[in-house]
């Protein structure tokens, strides 16, 4: 027989077995021009000393075979015997070592047998009811063609499914999609309604992620504030990462989860923008305001479950950084610049209403004054800060005020506001004997002893009503108590407490006066 | 040698069933196609329905397509032929065929033989 032809003999070997694990596997023949025809196979198990037959049966109840030696390739003519217009059989024996194995056989018409492509390019992926939609171009002249899929998760093997009849320019698969585990996915095509024909090699893997992305499982930690008002968010625990099928470890796309930090700052709400996200790797560094942090997982389907922490404001406070001055005209504060052109924002609130939103104020980009200050100002018609309480101020500066991760903390302290001279003056001073020649004034506490850092010292003063004489005692601003001694007996006396701030002396309280009575002997 | 053994024939009225099984002896059965033939008396063999040895191709006569079913099991070296809606016409000896060769159509020269077993339809 010639090695082009078909050779209508029997074959130079004993009868195959098909059963065995090794052997040849997955015979494809198919057109490959307008009179040329292709078959190829895998073999599986030892290669060395293998011989291939490729065998066909025609209709006519003939039987031929080419030799092909150790190639699992063959190509040939529609000259070489082999009918191309009628159903053929065709099949593979492979003779090794005194035993002959036998493919799984392909019955077709080979003229109709063309080579179909897989999937090629970009095959979308979407949600549909549930389930995983793929869609692509379908290749050039090579529409209509029965599409098959096969699946797998980390832990499962290939399992095989049908996408059914495509007869369109575009074709679709609708598949199963896992909740909790990626997959990967292939495609693959042949002709339709040529059930003997070759299916097409398998496409690309798609990789597809869990409908449900992972909940992120991470943990931060917050430095403490830095010197120029800003403290580093830092991220202390990765999110796990999704176990991948094996076509998908590589840098395959399509099955990542991508992890977001939102971030939003309370503080401030009067700068232009309260909320950026940005991704989880770039960790930012926050002022000392309050922020509630939230990371997002989202994969190709959109976004999943969130975990959320609120990041409580730095409470460090500075009490001297700023300086207050009231005058006729209104109020004005003063604090240590920043930068050139930089915008502040200085927000302030009533002590013990953390909870409702505080007042907020956004300066203009300014430059440090002479004296190297920042100020704002603001009139008494404002009524800002006029209720006689305390309040919390912070002020922070950015020279970027729309980017959020670029706000810093200035200052951070306490102020009384109203008339804090009056508002201050210390109630209930009342006088104790203490013994012959000493008395004890108490007092209720100063208003502005509820204001962190505000109250710099009580003074007592004590008035000899016979010569006149003044003396005044200072007091440390957390007691509300003082001995005066050296008091002479049957003389009156008048006694006055007030509270001072670092800026302001207090009014003095209503006199109190008193004697010590004179002790008559028995 | 390959020894082929029909069992499952009998009488059955018309429009009943009837389950034919072919069995082999030997281990490389698996690795050969198998077809049933029929005859009846002064009449040539008439081919009925054949299958592959991975069972992936099948062919039937037009006479008995869609009635009758031709499957295998190769774990028991076993072909069936599963015969419904059974006509007085279809009153043969059947026998069954085993080949190394696959035959895409009702011609093809099978190498090995069983003795038959009779096939009866009444009406």
């Known amino acids: 027989c010639r090695t082009s032809e078909c050779c209508f003999q029997d074959p130079p070997y004993s009868d195959a077995d098909s059963g065995s694990a090794s052997g040849p596997r997955d015979l494809s023949c198919y057109r490959i021009s307008s009179a040329g025809y292709e078959c190829s196979w895998q073999y599986e198990g030892p290669t060395a000393g293998v011989s291939h037959f490729l065998r066909c049966c025609l209709s006519s109840g003939r039987c031929c075979y080419f030799a092909t030696g150790s190639a699992t390739r063959l190509q040939f003519s529609d000259q070489a015997g082999v009918s191309v217009l009628h159903t053929v059989t065709l099949w593979v024996e492979s003779w090794a070592r005194n035993r002959t194995e036998k493919s799984p056989e392909v019955t077709l018409q080979l003229y109709k047998s063309v080579k179909y492509k897989p999937p090629l390019g970009d095959i979308k992926v979407s949600k549909l009811a549930g389930q995983l939609r793929m869609e692509w171009e379908t290749p050039d002249n090579q529409v209509g063609a029965e599409v098959q899929f096969r699946h797998r998760t980390p832990s499962s093997s290939w399992k095989l499914g049908d996408c059914g009849p495509q007869d369109d320019d575009t074709e679709s698969c609708l598949c199963p999609l896992e909740m909790n585990v990626a997959q990967e996915f292939q495609l693959r095509r042949r002709r339709l309604g040529s059930q003997g024909s070759s299916w097409s090699k398998w496409s690309s893997p798609v990789c597809v992620p869990p409908e449900n992305p992972p909940q992120p499982q991470v943990r931060f930690s917050v430095e403490q504030l830095g010197r120029d008002g800003r403290r580093r968010l830092t991220l202390k625990e990765q999110p796990t990462q999704l176990e991948l099928p094996e076509g998908c470890q590589g840098p395959a796309p399509g099955v990542e989860v991508t992890y977001q930090l939102q971030l939003h700052m309370l503080s401030c709400p009067c700068k232009a923008k309260a909320t950026r996200t940005l991704p989880l790797e770039k960790m930012p560094y926050l002022s000392g305001a309050a922020y509630n942090v939230a990371v997002i997982s989202s994969n190709r389907f959109g976004p999943g479950p969130n975990q959320t922490w609120h990041i409580p404001a730095d409470t460090h406070t500075e009490p001297v950084a700023l300086n207050i001055s009231v005058g006729t005209n209104g109020t004005t504060m003063y604090w240590p610049a920043r930068a050139q052109s930089t915008t502040y924002c200085i927000e302030w609130q009533p002590v013990g209403q953390e909870g409702s939103l505080a007042t907020c104020n956004l300066t203009a980009p300014q430059d440090p004054d002479p004296a190297g200050m920042a100020t704002y100002s603001w009139s008494r018609e404002s009524g800002a800060m006029g209720q006689e309480k305390c309040y919390h101020i912070t002020i922070f500066a950015s020279a970027h005020p729309k980017k959020l991760t670029l706000w810093s903390t200035v200052l951070s302290t306490y102020h009384f506001g109203g008339n804090a001279s009056a508002a201050g003056t210390p109630h209930h001073v009342s006088v104790k004997n203490h013994s012959l020649d000493s008395v004890s004034v108490d007092w209720a506490p100063s208003l502005l002893s509820t204001c962190p850092g505000v109250l710099k010292e009580y003074v007592v003063r004590c008035r000899d009503e016979d010569s006149n004489q003044v003396s005044e005692h200072p007091v440390q601003p957390t007691e509300t108590q003082v001995t005066l001694s050296d008091l002479r007996a049957g003389v009156a006396y008048t006694v006055q407490v007030r509270a001072d701030t670092a800026w302001l002396r207090g009014a003095w309280s209503q006199p109190q006066r008193f004697s010590i009575k004179v002790q008559v002997s028995d | 040698q390959v020894q082929l053994v029909e069992s499952g024939g009998g009488l059955v009225q018309a429009g009943g069933s009837l389950r034919l099984s072919c069995a082999a002896s030997?281990?490389?059965?698996?690795?050969?196609?198998v077809a049933w033939f029929r005859q009846t008396p002064g009449k040539e063999r008439e081919f009925v329905a054949s299958?592959?040895?991975?069972?992936?191709?099948?062919n039937y006569a037009d006479s008995v397509k869609g009635r009758f079913t031709i499957s295998r099991d190769n774990a028991k070296n076993t072909v069936f032929l599963q015969m419904n809606s059974l006509k007085p016409a279809d009153t043969a000896v059947y026998y069954c065929a085993a080949d190394r060769n696959y035959y895409p159509s009702v011609l093809g020269k099978y190498t090995y033989w069983g003795q038959g077993t009779q096939v009866t339809v009444s009406s």
């Open positions: 299958i592959s040895w991975s069972g992936g191709s099948t």
């Open positions: 030997a281990r490389i059965f698996n690795s050969y196609a």
